[in-house]
Interface confidence: medium
């Protein structure tokens, strides 16, 4: 239904507090070197003027789109130039354009100092004088490092780090409540990050089709008893709801999620037993919630997949009535049989069931050719199993941070011209999916492992089309989302690399390393690691192991000693020189 | 490259019948559900129904229903449209239309069929 | 039974301007809708499928977007060749039937 004020509209429908978070989270992701304050202050302009609109629908510029309301609002931020340079073209554009220019800008990997937590006593007098502002400058601080993070989502995010703060500052011993419990929720929204960042993606480069395809699968496998009708339904509204927030329309995305969610709380009869739990709680917390809900029981009657899909003899006719509803009823009745595949394993076989068919249905007898189409999923579905297997193995065998550093050696030597802090950064998360997944039940794994992976797999595409280097990763990034994985894994050495010359200030240390943080420690040592791949590409897991073991015995060692600095520079050069002869 | 062409226009009197014909080339005509689809003067287009070329099982929208009968003939790759008992309100031009993945495309040329007394 | 209706019935506009024409259906459709040109004693082209989807050989110009019950076609800026009427259609989920939109004539101005 239309409305006279679009800005009104979503005020009313959100509540001022969402209202201003979600503006904030928007200002945030498209200008992300703006401060807090100045982006504070457009928050409060805007929500003044939205205001003024419920009161009076008719009044001066309500009835304008929000993206010019948005639009006009940063375009007239002072020395917007000076700040963001070419940014400031899309001002000269009108709506849409504008606004894709504005998405087009948006920056994955902007060069912001990281995120530092300050000391727990700090965070909790600050906190106790002015939560709104504290919170704000978590929104801030997060919009504009993830500018794609799904906007709902992320003030679910500040309402867990609110109650947090509030539990842990009455506590005696801050420090050691909020470390753990805040820890979890940076986890948690990392991995979140990426995972919006892929829908998007999909939904960038391959269309709403491609984002509704997934949303199929992934539906199917959660609400098994839920008919098709019900889950199409789902993975329309789910689809323009990412394609919202996706585009920047956060007011209307975080909106629409609430509907479907009041949708999904109202029909659970029709989709799934397992929705009560969430429905009980708050709408952030039951978004959340319904989006990460256990999978219903499997229908104990399900026939085989075959009798449709196969052995009917109306396969071509059914498929070339209507090619997408035929191939979504196999995706949904594939999918709902395998909560224990990947959303990605599961449209690669309906890829391939596609492939089949259209190969097959031109030819003169059809049943016998895609006869056989179901045996021929099997070598698709053994690959991302033998990998799990494979890596949750040598993730069981050499923990979180020696399974980063084998993970470092194989991307590095498939991508030595990826520069190196991209390696590492890769190698770090793709490692962590060892202690996400590896620890799951048997038939949770694949699932966590590969769509995990393709993920992060995402972001490593997404920074490498900045300054592209690498002929293997082009050509893996390049391809369909779902292949890109497999793609990846296939890589081997890139035997085209001329290896870097060794050069020993690479491999110099100086006692400051003693003092950081074990996670900064542990990225010291595997951007060492990564250019002792690119200098010798070929170097055997034996020689490398060599060197590195090596390296932590002389950090160990100097480190521990009376005198750091004096240890360091001379027992420094004799470990380089050892690298060079372990490796030669 | 795929075509469809369509027979001639067509003059008749109330009461006759009347076949027209939609000849494909340039694919294979048993891989495509076929459709008819009316257009009469000054107005817009009205789907008719359509047909699967390999058993010739066809589908009628309810409005055309016993009005017209589609057929095909494998053997000339050729699709038809016949009516046993035209009347003057079945004057309209007629295309047929290779369904493709849920839209219609290439269309035939059309074929007018005027029926007047 | 569905009904597309299609809005504005005539638009009148320049070239180089940008039309914007709407199809909205009764009933939520998912993205199974197709939008077509006809120019005067020619056959229907084909511009978008699936809601969204330009057809082989159509200029960049023409976009389709929406989904559920509101669906719009984009000429982005009108060019001499594009006065025609364009008509949206529809499919039905399962088992599959077609209906057309009464169709949007633009004129040149």
């Known amino acids: 239904e239309a409305h006279k004020s679009e800005i009104a509209h979503r005020y009313n429908d959100l509540g001022e507090q969402h209202f201003k978070g979600l503006v904030l989270i928007a200002f945030s992701q498209y200008l992300q070197k703006c401060s807090y304050d100045e982006h504070a202050k457009l928050v409060q302009e805007v929500t003044d003027f939205a205001k003024t609109c419920v009161a009076d629908e008719s009044a001066a510029n309500c009835d304008k789109s929000l993206h010019t309301l948005f639009g006009d609002k940063l375009c007239a931020i002072p020395n917007l130039r000076e700040n963001y340079g070419e940014l400031a073209d899309c001002c000269t554009k009108q709506e849409p354009e504008r606004n894709e220019c504005f998405l087009q800008h948006k920056d994955d990997n902007p060069s912001l100092p990281p995120f530092e937590r300050p000391e727990a006593e700090a965070m909790c007098t600050s906190f106790k004088e002015n939560p709104t502002t504290f919170m704000g400058h978590y929104l801030h601080e997060v919009a504009r490092r993830h500018p794609y993070f799904y906007a709902p989502e992320l003030l679910y995010y500040a309402e867990q780090y609110n109650e947090i703060l509030t539990q842990c500052c009455a506590e005696a011993d801050k420090e050691s409540c909020l470390t753990p419990k805040l820890d979890g929720v940076k986890e948690k929204a990392l991995v979140s990050s990426v995972r919006q960042r892929m829908k998007c993606s999909s939904m960038q480069k391959f269309g709403e089709r491609a984002f509704k395809a997934w949303a199929v699968a992934r539906l199917s496998q959660t609400f098994p008893n839920a008919d098709f009708a019900e889950i199409t339904k789902l993975a329309t509204d789910l689809t323009k709801v990412n394609k919202e927030c996706c585009h920047g329309d956060l007011l209307e995305c975080a909106d629409d999620r609430a509907e479907l969610a009041k949708y999904m709380c109202e029909n659970q009869a029709t989709i799934s037993s397992k929705l009560q739990t969430c429905c009980d709680k708050p709408l952030l917390k039951k978004a959340h919630c319904l989006s990460e809900v256990e999978h219903d029981t499997m229908p104990a009657d399900l026939p085989a997949i075959a009798a449709d899909f196969v052995e009917d003899q109306e396969v071509c006719k059914n498929y070339a009535e209507a090619k997408d509803v035929f191939l979504g009823t196999f995706l949904y009745e594939y999918s709902r049989r395998h909560p224990d595949y990947s959303v990605s394993l599961l449209l690669r076989l309906a890829k391939k069931y596609e492939a089949t068919l259209e190969k097959c249905c031109a030819e003169a007898n059809p049943p016998a050719c895609y006869g056989t189409v179901l045996a021929e999923f099997q070598p698709l579905v053994e690959e991302p199993k033998n990998l799990v297997k494979t890596n949750c193995d040598l993730y069981e065998k050499l923990g979180e941070y020696g399974f980063q550093n084998a993970i470092l050696v194989r991307y590095t030597q498939k991508a030595p011209q990826v520069s190196t802090p991209t390696l590492v950064e890769a190698a770090r998360n793709l490692g962590r999916v060892g202690t996400k997944c590896c620890t799951l039940p048997e038939d949770q794994r694949l699932p966590c492992v590969e769509d995990y992976l393709s993920a992060i797999l995402n972001r490593v595409c997404l920074l490498h089309e900045k300054t592209p280097v690498s002929e293997h990763v082009t050509k893996c990034c390049s391809g369909s989302l779902v292949e890109r994985r497999p793609c990846f894994s296939a890589l081997t050495v890139d035997e085209t690399y001329v290896p870097k010359e060794f050069k020993a200030e690479t491999f110099t240390f100086h006692s400051d390393i003693c003092t950081l943080p074990e996670k900064e420690k542990q990225i010291k040592k595997q951007t060492a690691l990564a250019e002792l791949v690119k200098h010798k590409p070929k170097a055997t897991a034996e020689q490398l192991k060599t060197v590195m073991d090596d390296f932590a015995q002389f950090l160990d060692t100097c480190c521990k000693a009376a005198d750091k600095d004096t240890c360091f520079s001379t027992e420094g050069p004799n470990l380089v020189t050892r690298c060079k002869d372990a490796l030669a | 490259e795929v075509q469809l062409v369509q027979s001639g226009t067509e003059v008749k009197k109330p009461g006759e019948s009347l076949k027209i014909s939609c000849k494909i080339s340039g694919y294979s005509f048993t891989a495509y559900w076929i459709a008819w689809v009316r257009q009469m003067p000054g107005k817009g287009l009205e789907w008719m129904g359509m047909?699967?070329?390999?058993?010739?099982?066809?589908r009628y929208s309810p409005s055309f229903q016993g009005q017209v009968t589609f057929s095909v003939d494998k053997s000339i790759s050729t699709a038809y449209l016949q009516w046993h008992s035209l009347k003057t309100s079945d004057t309209a031009v007629y295309y047929c239309a290779r369904l493709y993945s849920g839209s219609y495309s290439p269309w035939g040329q059309g074929t007018l069929v005027t029926v007047s007394s | 039974e569905l009904v597309l209706t299609q809005s504005p019935g005539t638009l009148s506009l320049s070239p180089g301007e940008r039309a914007t024409l709407s199809c909205r259906a009764s009933q939520s459709i998912f993205n199974y809708v197709a939008w077509y040109q006809q120019k005067p004693g020619q056959a229907p082209r084909l511009l978008i499928y699936?809601?969204?989807n330009r057809a082989t050989g159509i200029p960049a110009r023409f976009s389709g977007s929406g989904s559920g019950t509101d669906f719009t076609l984009t000429i982005s800026s009108l060019e001499p060749e594009d006065f025609a009427v364009y008509y949206c259609?529809?499919?039905?989920?399962?088992?599959?039937?077609?209906?057309f939109g009464q169709g949007t004539r633009v004129d040149i101005k």
């Open positions: 259609q529809q499919r039905s989920k399962w088992p599959p039937t077609w209906t």
């Open positions: 047909i699967w070329p390999p058993d010739a099982d066809a």
């Open positions: 699936d809601a969204s």
